[in-house]
Interface confidence: low
């Protein structure tokens, strides 16, 4: 665990119960960098400071997670706390693995979504396709598409079938898939972001 995570946790622990509630609500509407999904509202609202820190780091990685936390704290008028958080993060940035510091490739190349960039790797490496389908069903997948993917015999063929529908998706639809991947296989997403 890196220094940024500790700094985020320190900041959130020092919020009052009311401030933490306000922080979560602001987090639901704060502008996000391209390629990043939003933490689901249902899960978010029941979290304590430690849960929320874990979720921020798994969704946004340490560097962007700290930056986002500082932005929300500033929006709440807690400039001093935001400054302390960023100071602590920058102080430790040299010690963290270089890959963690880099923004995701989807942010670096706005023309190509993360999902499209890493199509081959996702087909080969995603293991819990059923989970993704449940997350996407009714939002970007029709009942027919959902059943068609489920009918495939292996995970790679399921993912291939899923990707056959993505040409019709807009950026937001692809964000939903990325968000579902972050929730179900965050280590895979982080690995691909560093690659």
């Amino acid at each position: 665990m890196g220094r940024a995570r500790d700094a985020i946790l320190d900041a959130l622990e020092n919020l009052t119960a009311e401030e933490l509630k306000k922080f979560k609500l602001k987090l639901l509407s704060v502008p996000l960098r391209e390629g990043y999904g939003r933490i689901p509202r249902g899960a978010l609202l029941s979290m304590d400071a430690l849960d929320l820190t874990d979720k921020l780091v798994s969704f946004y990685l340490e560097t962007y997670g700290a930056e986002l936390t500082a932005n929300v704290l500033r929006d709440m008028g807690l400039q001093e706390m935001a400054g302390q958080l960023q100071a602590a993060t920058h102080q430790g940035s040299g010690a963290a693995p270089a890959g963690i510091q880099a923004p995701p490739q989807s942010a670096a190349k706005p023309g190509l979504h993360f999902i499209d960039q890493h199509r081959a790797a996702l087909i080969a490496r995603v293991t819990n396709v059923e989970w993704l389908l449940d997350a996407l069903y009714g939002k970007v997948l029709t009942d027919e598409q959902y059943q068609a993917v489920r009918a495939e015999p292996t995970n790679p063929s399921k993912m291939r079938k899923l990707f056959s529908f993505t040409p019709a998706w807009n950026w937001t639809c692809k964000d939903l898939l990325l968000q579902a991947l972050r929730e179900s296989q965050s280590y895979l997403v982080e690995d691909l972001e560093r690659s």
Partner: antibody, heavy 118, light 111 residues
Amino acid sequence: EVQLQQSGAELVRPGSSVKMSCKTSGYTFTNYGITWVKQRPGQGLEWIGYIYVGNGYTEYNEKFKDKAALTSDTSSSTAYMQLTSLTSDDSTIYFCARIAQGRCFDYWGQGTTLSVSS
Amino acid sequence: DIVLTQSPASSAVSLGQRATISCRASQSVSTSSYSYMHWYQQKPGQPPKLLIKYASTLESGVPARFSGSGSGTDFTLNIHPVEEEDTATYYCQHSWELPYMFGGGTKLEIK
């Protein structure tokens, strides 16, 4: 008074499934999570996973991801754990507990003993 | 995963004396505000009982002879003076990250 009452002992066949319950009372069920812990006789405690009953959000110990499924029913203030593809290795006692702030476990059920035998 | 190592595995302490149980984490489980380490007591045939949370905060209803200390990776549970009813197994547990882990336990016997 906060109480967690677990279902009675189970004797099941290898390869089958079992669903045990943890009925809570004395507090607002949806304001807390419920965690499940495994303990083999004379041995230590193993964390299985938890569920935030307010929204059904779950987290599992990787070791139990394909073994346990946690659910809850807010109308009866009851949490459930289903264990599948049972083997003799699953024969032991299982506890449910309430998750308090800081993710410590402040109230525990009395335990459900599972015996898997042909 | 963070591993918690408890020592000793078992201990026999004379009535009225001090019992000390150690728990070492394989990495820090503390921030400047809190330590995410908790202590439980378990008697035979019973579920565990929370004694101390956040390394040093005594749970409501727990006798003051129980105390906890430590931060970072090293934590201690002290019982002083020990009483007959303290015969039990004691476990530490961290909640720093998933998966939450328990220590292997320390069996305390009162002489």
